[in-house]
Amino acid sequence: HTAAQDNCTCPTNKMTVCSPDGPGGRCQCRALGSGMAVDCSTLTSKCLLLKARMSAPKNARTLVRPSEHALVDNDGLYDPDCDPEGRFKARQCNQTSVCWCVNSVGVRRTDKGDLSLRCDELVRTHHILIDLRHRPTAGAFNHSDLDAELRRLFRERYRLHPKFVAAVHYEQPTIQIELRQNTSQKAAGDVDIGDAAYYFERDIKGESLFQGRGGLDLRVRGEPLQVERTLIYYLDEIPPKFSMKRLTA
């Protein structure tokens, strides 16, 4: 009888099925939907989380201007195809044989096509801009306190290396968090910025993916930071390929 058998759950992903049947009675966890093994010491990939979610029952500017190539996830939820390592496959298709190419965070980066559509490689999202608007407060937050708190959050809760939090901008009531991570910078074991951003997004919406932890309680010097709107922009290492028709619509 081991500690694992007493508490066989996945601290970093509640959308798992766990059983104490690993070596020496260790707890072994698999993602809902895909049945893939999950490493409970770090964040689960966004692709496996989306798959699990789809399998579950339905329930004078200092701010950054997103570039013309920035993508916003307008397509919403879909049941993705993940590769054996849990990453998004470059080409995604639905049940009606409509296909499209996605980036490393699973956001569509081409027009939709048919089964003949080719997506040669999974293009990496290397820059994520998280744009938040907080609820009215008595006064503005102190910028350096806000910066420190958000960096602490990404380091401690999401285990994202501090070097990948490029900047925190603030112009009341708008907060922008910039995450940057090139392919060459990401070492084995590093949390992916796309996964950290997805966990943060779900936390902000009150849909925490962590097992048994309370929801996100963000405070800056004791003052609650309550977010009322979130927009996330994704920038890829290679610009997306959309037809002019979409760009002028």
């Epitope: 081991t2 500690a3 694992a4 508490n7 996945c10 690993g22 070596p23 020496g24 260790r26 707890c27 072994q28 966890c29 093994a37 999950v38 490493d39 409970c40 010491s41 054996p84 390592e85 084995a188």
Partner: nanobody, 121 residues
Framework: QVQLQESGGGMVQVGGSLRLSCAAS????????MSWVRQAPGKGPEWVSY????????YYPDSVKGRFTISRDNAKNTLYLLMNNLKPEDTALYRC??????????????WGQGTQVTVSS
Amino acid sequence: QVQLQESGGGMVQVGGSLRLSCAASGFPFSSADMSWVRQAPGKGPEWVSYINADGSKTYYPDSVKGRFTISRDNAKNTLYLLMNNLKPEDTALYRCARAKLTDTHYVEDYWGQGTQVTVSS
């Protein structure tokens, strides 16, 4: 990138033996824990043996204990699985996997394509 290539599978009679090999590359094999995992048609994956990085600790589930032996040669970056007294229920695709064992959890993070083992009666 991590690559794991299994060999040694095949068809064998009940009670027979097979020795599987797994050639590893793309990561520091000598500091990695490793496992053999099998998957029978229509069933989920099941680990059948585990060995730590230096080969000093091994684990087996009850279903194969006393029949299967896992070993490794770190100089050759190769993992082995000796399977004796094979039974029809051992029929499956066998894959080697890089593994991680903590005080409480176990996970595999990379797998080979696998080698098929078929035990006929």
